[in-house]
Amino acid sequence: MMTGTIETTGNISAEKGGSIILQCHLSSTTAQVTQVNWEQQDQLLAICNADLGWHISPSFKDRVAPGPGLGLTLQSLTVNDTGEYFCIYHTYPDGTYTGRIFLEVLESSVAEHGARFQIP
């Protein structure tokens, strides 16, 4: 019987060009985590295998960093990064636990990057 639960960072937002940490935490189970997969719309971003460590997909290698912990850091965000992300915990003997995070990447604030007016 699967007793575990996954807590995630839920719905999050970040600015274009910035970075964000995607975090999931598996609790309430003594199952052994054999691998954690990070996926976006059926695309595999990265895995952290208990035996063989972190492996990042070549498509994301320049913008994805492992950690902290079993989390994933996305860098140089673009508006196209907006969407659902899934952490998939493969465990023994329980099986698979999945957590969902929705990331919204926002255009940089006008205050920071907009036109600046000088008072004469």
């Epitope: 595999l44 895995i47 492996h55 493969h90």
Partner: nanobody, 118 residues
């Protein structure tokens, strides 16, 4: 049927080199992480090195960094472990292993003996 067949082990003097090979069959090579582990007499099996995604990712245990190099030939479905500057403490049975990118399920080879004499 998944098969991992190691070769290249043997007896070598300290400071020497060996190249281990692991020929894989029965699965799509690019969908897996390939790795090497080793087990010395009376000790637990330990991670040595791993490679994935057509060689774009490699990991090494601290004890072998700078001395061992992992590589893969995707056309031959073979992973290699080039071992240089070998030390007596590298003596062990070396096992090839694989883990599926999608779900982590794994397979092991039968192992090849490496003995480093001082």
């Amino acid at each position: 049927e998944v098969q991992l067949v190691e070769s290249g082990g043997g007896l070598v003097q300290a400071g020497g080199s060996l190249r281990l090979s692991c020929a894989a069959s029965g699965f799509t090579f690019s969908d897996y992480v390939m790795g090497w582990f080793r087990q010395a007499p009376g000790k637990e099996r330990e991670f040595v090195s791993a490679i994935s995604w057509s060689g774009t990712n490699t990991n090494y245990a601290d004890s072998v960094k700078g001395r061992f190099t992992i590589s893969a030939d995707n056309a031959k479905n073979t992973v290699y472990l080039q071992m240089n500057s070998l030390k007596p403490e590298d003596t062990a049975v070396y096992y090839c292993a694989t883990r599926a990118l999608r779900d982590g399920r794994g397979y092991w080879g039968q192992g090849t003996q490496v003995t480093v004499s001082s």
